[in-house]
């Protein structure tokens, strides 16, 4: 991955590097240090620094993104003297030339979906490529299965989702013969970027009073417990007026989920349908297919 | 109905093993993940390890390494935990729970307790 | 030693509104991890109350609500019963470790 890193130090260099594939950053060891601290500044001023022992000479960022251009600082003092380092790690390339419009989707628990635009400025000969190393492993994946627009990669279809884990790092390089091209990365948390399936198994029991409707949870990607699912129950009398409200019902996930409203005979034809969402994000599945109850002449 | 029930009190020798049992009735347990808890006498509850999606594998709290083992018998659907080399200080009770949420770990339905006493 | 404190106790008169508290530090609640919230009847089994920090279980009365500030959290009991008096334990995730971390308890009376 080609980036320019440009080192401003003082006389006697610690000799700072990073590598942005382990996020790593290491310096040489000084003799009989007593101190060191290493951070990152973005260009928003925001200051990134993780925990080092001591007797360390590197330190590894876990949860950053790099494309708008940071810079590494390293501080040791040692029983003689102190050394301080900045590393500027800028985006080199063509401004506007890096994929933009990034996102992805996992839909169908087991299949993920990215998409992205080619860069405003970038040259006619671009290639884009991604890479996705999860937080736990440092594992890296490279795209299987490319989305091509005129022979460009615009997108990648992912179909074995093993390598990921909660939080993940996504990394589109590009390439050109023509002038370099800046890099985009981002970190996406899988439980955010998850579309649910509607609810299984829905099912409607009635007795002379009451209609009982079950359901099951849909399956998901993330491994997610009854408790983290909110459902909508849309309850419908067929043949109404149009304009008419439906019944929205808000139910939370139970380890048997069901809902049981009153409906006495002869109860008109209706219709229920489902959705489900995670109870913290509420980003709704598409509805279920609607499940009929009752007569026409009720 | 879910329930989970839980075996009988036990009164076990220092050095000793124990095994409680918990049964999961009106689900199949292959759909479920189950935490073991403890709380000694007058005191307050302590995880002991349980199924973690994250690791795909069953963890175990710190002080618990070596000495517990979770098992799971899918075809009784009962959930096992067995604790060796027990001390005094292991009396206790022992709940199993039903994980509710796992992003934190909630626990949403526990077993009724089983008392184990560590005496010599 | 809980990393999560809580008063060991807490008293209210039928009808009132209590409130426990449950502090915790940067690792845990604030670093943020959702907090639930359990009651223990006397003799009983614990049961979950509260989760991802204001949301009930069906079943559980209206009466009872939680909430989360920083590194805090806290379970309001409004319109005090009797068959409230229990132990009340509040839980979390410590960064870096597996499971769930409980705090020590606080013991709820209903004068």
């Known amino acids: 991955e080609k980036s320019d890193l440009r080192t401003v130090a003082p006389a006697s260099s610690l000799n700072v590097r990073f590598d942005s594939r382990t996020m790593n950053l290491s310096w040489d060891c000084q003799e009989n240090t007593t101190f060191s601290k290493c951070f990152l500044t973005d260009k928003k001023n925001r200051v990134v620094e993780p925990r080092l022992s001591n007797n360390e000479c590197s330190c590894t960022f876990r949860e950053i993104c790099l494309h708008e251009g940071v810079t590494f600082e390293v501080h040791v003092n040692t029983s003689q003297r102190g050394f301080q380092q900045k590393l500027l790690y800028p985006n080199s390339g063509r401004e506007g030339t890096a994929a933009q419009n990034f996102s992805c989707f996992i839909y169908n628990a087991d299949l993920m979906n990215c998409t992205w635009a080619r860069g405003p400025t970038a040259p006619r000969d671009v290639q884009y490529f991604l890479y996705i190393r999860n937080s736990k492993r440092r594992r890296e994946i490279r795209c299987p299965y490319y989305i091509q627009d005129s022979g460009t990669h615009v997108g990648c279809h992912l179909d074995n989702l093993s390598g990921l884990t909660s939080r993940n790092y996504f990394l589109v390089n590009g390439t050109s013969r023509e002038i370099g091209i800046q890099f985009f990365d981002s970190l996406l948390d899988t439980k955010k970027i998850e579309r649910f399936n509607p609810p299984s198994n829905v099912t409607v029991r009635c007795n002379t009073t009451h209609c009982l409707v079950r359901w099951k949870q849909p399956r998901t990607y993330q491994k997610l417990s009854y408790l983290d699912f909110q459902y909508q129950l849309d309850v419908h009398r067929k043949n109404t007026q149009p304009g008419t409200e439906n019944l929205l019902i808000n139910v939370s996930g139970d380890l048997e989920n069901r809902y049981n409203f009153p409906s006495s005979e002869p109860r008109a034809k209706h219709s229920v349908k489902i959705r489900a969402a995670d109870v913290r994000i509420l980003n709704w599945s598409s509805w279920s297919e609607a499940i009929e109850f009752g007569s026409d002449d009720g | 109905q879910v329930q989970l029930v839980q075996s009988g009190a036990e009164v076990k020798k220092p050095g000793a093993s124990v095994k409680v049992s918990c049964k999961v009735s009106g689900y199949t347990l292959t759909e479920l993940s189950i935490h073991w808890v403890r709380q000694a006498p007058g005191k307050g509850l302590e995880w002991m390890g349980g199924f973690d999606p994250e690791e795909n594998e069953i963890v175990y709290a710190q002080r618990f390494q070596g000495r517990v083992t979770m098992t799971e018998d899918t075809s009784t659907d009962t959930a096992y935990m067995e604790l060796s080399s027990l001390r005094s200080e292991d009396t206790a009770v022992y709940y199993c729970?039903?994980?509710?949420?796992?992003?934190?770990?909630?626990?949403?339905?526990w077993g009724q307790g089983t008392m184990v006493t560590v005496s010599s | 030693q809980s990393v999560l404190t809580q008063p060991p106790s807490v008293s209210g008169a039928p009808g009132q509104r209590v409130t426990i508290s449950c502090t915790g530090s940067g690792s845990n609640i604030g670093a943020p991890y959702d907090v639930s919230w359990y009651q223990q009847l006397p003799g009983t089994a614990p049961k979950l109350l509260i989760y991802h920090n204001n949301k009930r279980p069906s079943g559980v009365p209206d009466r009872f609500s939680g909430s989360k500030s920083g590194t805090s959290a806290s379970l309001a009991i409004t319109g005090l019963q009797a068959e409230d008096e229990a132990d009340y334990y509040c839980a979390t995730v410590e960064a870096g470790l597996s499971g769930s971390v409980f705090g020590g308890g606080t013991k709820l009376t209903v004068l």
């Open positions: 729970a039903i994980v509710g949420s796992f992003s934190p770990l909630t626990l949403g339905l």
